[in-house]
């Protein structure tokens, strides 16, 4: 004999207390597949979480983060505080990027400026806390007629070894 529970559709649960009736999920719960013997409790988007998609009888709620925070982890399992560009989040809060590093987003860490000299290039635009350096053409590219780009400043840019 076929198990009657296997035919209970999504949005219901097979209620053994009630002679295996396919009972609609109670408030604030859902079943996303058929044949369930219980409904799962809906996720509640509280505090720094806010509701991106309401829970329905067949699907869980989805959360994102309130302004000033951003999602981390699968399904936005955590909210992390935003920082300004040029900062990174530490245990003590948002801190400015150290000299020689930058962060052009409101999240994540400060990363070292690109070392142009590793590619045999020169620094065209200096780096800041918010922006990486812009590497210019290599000195070899600056032979007459090769380029009309203004030569870079002397190669004692902050955070870079002399070329």
């Amino acid at each position: 004999l076929q198990d009657p529970c296997s035919n209970c559709p999504a949005g219901t649960f097979c209620d053994n207390n009630r002679n295996q009736i396919c009972s609609p999920c109670p408030p604030n719960s859902f079943s996303s597949a058929g044949g369930q013997r219980t409904c799962d409790i809906c996720r509640q988007c509280k505090g720094v979480f806010r509701t991106r998609k309401e829970c329905s009888s067949t699907s869980n709620a989805e959360c994102d983060c309130t302004p000033g925070f951003h999602c981390l982890g699968a399904g936005c399992s955590m909210c992390e505080q935003d920082c300004k560009q040029g900062q990174e989040l530490t245990k003590k809060g948002c801190k400015d990027c150290c000299f020689g590093t930058f962060n052009d987003q409101k999240r994540g860490i400060c990363r070292p400026w690109t070392n142009c000299s590793l590619d045999g290039k020169s620094v065209l635009v200096n780096g800041t806390k918010e922006r990486d350096v812009v590497c210019g053409p290599s000195p070899a590219d600056l032979s007459p007629g090769a380029s009309s780009v203004t030569p870079p400043a002397p190669a004692r840019e902050p955070g870079h070894s002399p070329q």
Epitope: N7, P9, T12, C22, P24, P27, T38
Partner: antibody, heavy 118, light 112 residues
Framework: QVQLAQSGAEVKKPGASVKVSCKAS????????MHWVRQAPGQRLEWMGW????????KYSQEFQGRVTITRDTSASTAYMELSSLRSEDMAVYYC???????????WGQGTLVTVSS | DIVMTQSPLSLPVTPGEPASISCRSS???????????LGWHLQKPGQSPQLLIY???YRASGVPDRFSGSGSGTDFTLKISRVEAEDVGVYYC?????????FGGGTKVEIK
């Protein structure tokens, strides 16, 4: 919107059978159990049985066991309740009701009056 | 069978005044999932019953917030904070927990 439209009034002789239909619209018919309830004049509501969601297996009140048959036609989104061996005490208004919330009949048909008279 | 007992049988009310109906069950209606399986329906004159409250205290969609349900286990109450003329009819409690599902005998609410 959800609607349950029942068949019209019936007059039957004692010993006969009656089959009441309940056509559902505005929702996925197979996703919710359908119950049948009757109300004799001046009496409380009396539950008769249900047709479950999914494959539509049935459960009946012991009071009507052997006399009532609840069926459904999913393709026509219609539930049926047949009561046999009618007697005068079966004269009542018969309702279909959807269990659309947990343990709750959120929509009812308009009722079908069945008169049993010789 | 679970026997549902309602009181009072009749309740004359004054519009604007509160009203309260009691329902007792012969067995606990608390499901293993933590919800009380008790519903309240109103049957207005000449109409089909309509759902007011389910799972003891949850108001059905479109039901005015002057209606509230409370209680747990075997003792339940339906309260109307301020009765309006349209609230007249017979109120039934119902248990959908065990077969057979059973209804209370009804409470007739009428305007004084």
């Amino acid at each position: 919107q959800v609607q349950l439209a029942q068949s019209g009034a019936e007059v039957k002789k004692p010993g006969a059978s009656v089959k009441v239909s309940c056509k559902a619209s505005g929702y996925t018919f197979s996703s919710f159990p359908m119950h049948w309830v009757r109300q004799a004049p001046g009496q409380r509501l009396e539950w008769m049985g249900w047709s479950n969601a999914g494959i539509g297996n049935t459960k009946y009140s012991q009071e009507f066991q052997g006399r009532v048959t609840i069926t459904r036609d999913t393709s026509a989104s219609t539930a049926y309740m047949e009561l046999s061996s009618l007697r005068s005490e079966d004269m009542a208004v018969y309702y279909c009701a959807r269990e659309g919330l947990t343990g709750a009949f959120d929509y009812w048909g308009q009722g079908t009056l069945v008169t049993v008279s010789s | 069978d679970i026997v549902m007992t309602q009181s009072p049988l009749s309740l004359p009310v004054t519009p604007g005044e509160p009203a309260s109906i009691s329902c007792r069950s012969s067995q606990s209606l608390l499901h293993s999932n933590g919800y009380n399986y008790l519903g309240w329906h109103l049957q207005k004159p000449g109409q089909s019953p309509q759902l007011l409250i389910y799972l003891g205290s949850y108001r059905a969609s479109g039901v005015p917030d002057r209606f509230s349900g409370s209680g747990s286990g075997t003792d339940f109450t339906l309260k109307i904070s301020r009765v309006e003329a349209e609230d007249v009819g017979v109120y039934y409690c119902m248990q959908p927990l065990q077969i057979p599902l059973t209804f209370g005998g009804g409470t007739k609410v009428e305007i004084k």
